[in-house]
């Protein structure tokens, strides 16, 4: 599966979102992620799936990609841990725990993101942040500083339909409308942001962007709390 | 550097295919979208598809679906346009571009008996 | 599907002049894209979502515009700015370009 883009969004505050994560293959963007504890950064288990002889690494604080930010800071992974039942060829279960090599130095542009853990459905309509140094139109460009649009989260039975997902998505994975707004190739493992908590990780599966029949598939972080808690023990 | 190289011009038959090359490097074609282009003599630029080589998704222009195949080997990071049952109005060259940002030298392609 | 028609086809212009281009499109789009093309090279990206200036291209390019109208400006014209300018909207698919204008120096 590719790395999951923001399409149709716009680039954020600078380092309002002081959870996001890019990580990182040789030096380059590969995909997003959120900081959920001091040392350890949630993504999407896809993200590594090609990097077994290269160096992943995690930049915390940066809104710019390649500009000098004071706050910006690269860590080295100590540990990378996909969920156990996440497999190359689905979208389920497609999260992934990476420990930093320390503990990150904590400021106003560096913030861990509480996690939801009551395992309860997003209201359909409920307006949600999705950010990402993804793609940004559907040429392909890529974005340097950091992008975010607002999705409307999307009821399960209608992302379902046969001309949506056809019943792929399951009680673990929530959907958000993407007409023409959509997260996407670059986005993967990035934050869905509900109400100032963290819902759900943008899946890295095969999909169409900013195709309102094709919306976009989040893994739903309640869903996963006891492997969550269980790894960051 | 990024760079695309691409395959040495191609005279072919009326009725024949071809399979133009774009050779990357200095990037990562599977963070991308790679995309072709075509330019008949004297005209101007005509979008042709784009492939997403990370999961093979392509997308065609509606003059160019079933004339055009896209594909990509990402172990060589290459990008293939093949053209199929040529005629007199397929002679172009043919651009591959990373994006739109970079492109290639271009492939002169005849079609003549 | 959306068609940008570009306005004039030819012009010229005296070194140091500004020049002005249109692109204006059948329906609103908001990704526009501009590129430039000199006779026997490859197209080269000069703008990209309307107002960007691609990397490495002099400042004295500069695109505008909203909804159906676009435009392409030089600010001072140099001699190597001879060429023919296309547009291009990245908004519906399929993604189109305009027929070109063709810039020659006076």
């Known amino acids: 599966p590719p790395r999951g883009r923001i399409l149709g969004g716009r680039e954020a505050e600078a380092h309002a979102r002081p959870y996001m994560a890019s990580v990182q293959l040789n030096g380059a963007h590969l995909c997003g992620g959120v900081l959920v504890a001091e040392q350890w950064v949630l993504s999407a288990a896809h993200c590594l799936e090609d990097a077994a002889d290269g160096k992943v690494q995690v930049l915390l604080g940066a809104h710019s990609l390649s500009q000098p930010e004071p706050s910006k800071r690269l860590y080295d992974v100590l540990r990378a841990v996909p969920h156990p039942d996440s497999q190359p060829d689905t979208i389920d279960h497609d999260l992934l725990l990476l420990q930093l090599s320390e503990k990150a130095t904590l400021g106003p542009a560096v913030r861990p993101l509480p996690w939801q853990r009551v395992d309860r459905d997003v209201a359909p309509g409920t307006l949600c942040d999705v950010a990402g140094w993804g793609i940004v139109n559907h040429a392909g460009r890529r974005p340097d500083s950091l992008q975010h649009v607002l999705l409307p989260v999307l009821d399960r039975a209608t992302c379902n339909r046969r001309t949506h997902h056809d019943g792929a998505i399951t009680e673990r994975l929530m959907c958000a409308e993407s007409n023409r707004r959509d997260s996407c190739k670059g986005d993967s493992g990035g934050p869905l942001v509900c109400g100032g908590v963290l819902e759900g990780v943008v899946t890295s599966g095969s999909r169409v962007c900013g195709n309102r029949k094709k919306p976009g598939i989040y893994t739903r972080v309640a869903s996963y709390a006891a492997w969550i808690d269980s790894v960051l023990a | 550097e990024v760079q695309l190289q691409q395959s040495v011009a191609e005279l072919v038959r009326p009725g024949a295919s071809v399979k133009l090359s774009c050779s990357a490097s200095?990037?990562?074609?599977?963070?991308?979208?790679m995309h072709w282009v075509n330019q008949r003599p004297e005209q101007g630029l005509e979008w042709i598809g784009r492939?997403?080589?990370?999961?093979?998704?392509?997308k065609y222009a509606p003059n160019f679906q079933g004339k055009a195949t896209i594909t990509a080997d990402t172990s060589s990071n290459t990008a293939y346009l093949q053209l199929s049952n040529l005629t007199s109005e397929d002679t172009a060259i043919y651009y591959c571009?990373?994006?739109?940002?970079?492109w290639g030298q271009g492939t002169s392609v005849t079609v003549s008996s | 599907q959306i068609v940008l028609t570009q306005s004039p086809a030819i012009m010229s212009a005296s070194p140091g002049e500004k020049v002005t281009m249109t692109c204006s499109a059948s329906s609103s789009v908001s990704y526009m894209y501009w590129y430039q093309q000199k006779p026997g090279s490859s197209p080269r990206l000069l703008i990209y979502d309307i107002s960007n200036l691609a990397s490495g291209v002099p400042v004295r390019f500069s695109g505008s515009g909203s909804g159906t109208s676009y435009s392409l400006t030089i600010s001072r014209m140099e001699a190597e700015d001879a060429a023919t300018y296309y547009c291009q909207q990245w908004d519906t698919y399929p993604w189109t370009f305009g027929g070109g204008t063709k810039l020659e120096i006076k």
């Open positions: 571009t990373r994006a739109m940002d970079y």
């Open positions: 200095g990037f990562n074609i599977k963070n991308t979208y």
């Open positions: 492939i997403d080589p990370a999961n093979g998704i392509t």
